[in-house]
Interface confidence: medium
């Protein structure tokens, strides 16, 4: 092989446009064609003032979570690709995102990927006929719940109609109608389940997130091939623009341990 003449490869960030419904996971892929042994990969959101706000980072095989744990960075097994996911996206997550690779001092180099746009749309109970992104993990359950609730409501309406007919035809029997109804097990589900669906989706999602601080990683084809290990790292500094000066303190702890001195 002659001396390699590949240029130092830029980053790619895909898809360029991503649309998800609120509550779904939004996943971008940041890819580096070449990866060094020592680097930092940052995930940014572009603020309205065109500043880069750091969401999360990957450094020396450690995930460095940001303030908001919904933003996840996962290294895929090939070492070059990184999934950058927003767990349970919110409407205000819509915006411009990018990733940046920082090759560490003394010869600091910073590469930024092209920008990508995320659109988070309002959730509708009826799923769109053509989904622009992979369905979320909950979609099947949600569909089942919607069908279930619809069935219960139809059942309740039919029962009310039947009660009304009975009341009209047998006026004396109206006193006993409620008793008969209360013994019918499926009917119990109606009043019990109904309040859940009066909740605003966002509120429901919030309660779930409070109970489970580490929601499952986004569903991906590679899911069975790798594990996301979130290490407790230093608190990230969101809103700080990556620069050579800010990196002097970001030198990773020396990975001098481990068999064979392997780095990553």
């Amino acid at each position: 092989l002659d001396s390699p003449d590949r240029p130092w490869s830029p980053l790619t960030f895909s898809p360029a446009q991503l649309t998800v419904q609120e509550g779904e996971n939004a996943t971008f892929t940041c890819s580096l064609a070449d990866i060094p042994d020592s680097f930092v990969l940052n995930w940014y959101r572009l603020s309205p003032r065109n500043q880069t706000d750091k969401l999360a980072a990957f450094q020396e095989d450690r995930i460095e979570p940001g303030r908001d744990r919904r933003f996840r960075v996962t290294r895929l097994p090939n070492g070059r690709d990184f999934h950058m996911s927003i767990v349970a996206a919110r409407l205000n997550d819509s915006g411009i995102y990018l990733c940046g690779a920082i090759y560490l001092p003394p010869n600091t180099q910073i590469n930024e990927s092209p920008r990508a746009e995320l659109s988070v749309t309002e959730r509708t109970l009826e799923p769109p006929t053509q989904s622009p992104s992979p369905p979320p993990r909950l979609s099947g359950q949600l569909q089942g719940l919607v069908i279930g609730v619809t069935s219960v409501l139809v059942g309740v309406l039919l029962l009310l109609l039947l009660t009304w007919v009975l009341a009209a035809v047998f006026p004396r029997a109206t006193r006993g109608a409620c008793v008969c109804g209360s013994e019918d097990e499926p009917l119990k589900e109606g009043p019990d389940a109904a309040p859940v669906f009066t909740l605003d989706y966002g509120e429901l999602d919030f309660q779930w997130r409070e109970k489970t601080p580490e929601p499952p990683a986004p569903c991906a084809p590679e899911q069975t091939e790798y594990a996301t290990i979130v290490f407790p790292g230093r608190p990230a500094s969101p809103g700080r623009r990556a620069s050579a000066s800010s990196l002097q303190g970001a030198q990773p702890p020396s990975p001098e341990d481990g068999p064979g001195l392997w780095p990553l």
């Epitope: 001396s3 390699p4 240029p7 130092w8 580096l32 064609a33 070449d34 990866i35 060094p36 042994d37 020592s38 680097f39 097994p77 090939n78 070492g79 070059r80 090759y103 560490l104 001092p105 003394p106 010869n107 180099q109 790798y226 594990a227 020396s254 990975p255 001098e256 068999p259 064979g260 001195l261 392997w262 780095p263 990553l264």
Partner: antibody
Framework: QVQLVESGGDLVKPGGSLRLSCVAS????????MTWVRQVPGMGLQWVAY????????SYADAVKGRFTISRDNAKNTLYLHMNSLRAEDTALYYC?????????????WGQGTLVTVSS | DIVMTQTPLSLSVSPGEPASISCKAS???????????LYWFRQKPGQSPQRLVY???YRDPGVPDRFSGSGSGTDFTLRISRVEADDAGVYYC?????????FGQGTKLEIK
Amino acid sequence: QVQLVESGGDLVKPGGSLRLSCVASGFPFSSFHMTWVRQVPGMGLQWVAYVKTGGSSTSYADAVKGRFTISRDNAKNTLYLHMNSLRAEDTALYYCATGVVPTTVASSYWGQGTLVTVSS
Amino acid sequence: DIVMTQTPLSLSVSPGEPASISCKASQSLLHSSGYTYLYWFRQKPGQSPQRLVYKVVYRDPGVPDRFSGSGSGTDFTLRISRVEADDAGVYYCGQGIKDPFTFGQGTKLEIK
């Protein structure tokens, strides 16, 4: 354009010394672990030594331990191999490389090699 | 030291035909991290070596998908689905889990 250019190879007498250099360009040298690999002409590859990104961690093949020293100057994008007490069996083409061993990085660059001949 | 043994030591294949090279390690190359530190290199006549595959299955940038790596633990294989004239050279496997890092003795691929 990514390049690794070795130099310093020469004909030297047994017991003599040499310093090999490898100048890197076109990629963030200071972020890569560097390796020296040698090859006796017509024979296989043999790992010689390795230095991590910061320069403080090094490792050597048993055959060269105590005689060779690997070092790097990240400010100059240069990798070195100081060779003392040279023996006839050190005669080989010496390559500097990245992404050889030990690494999981998704890139590997090799120089063209510099020839060291140890003969009386 | 981990000994890497390649078979066959030479191979003659016609263009368009498949080729397969085996590499056996004297001990497992699987690390507790889940990574297996096995690499494949090719050296064309009169040139420097080039890495083709890292961590058993991942191709280096620019390496055609005709090349594929497989295996686990101690037994590994490099396959070329359809050999081309340009594939001639010596193929080496190498391990990166334990110092000293070792290479196989090489397999010479000749195109008929």
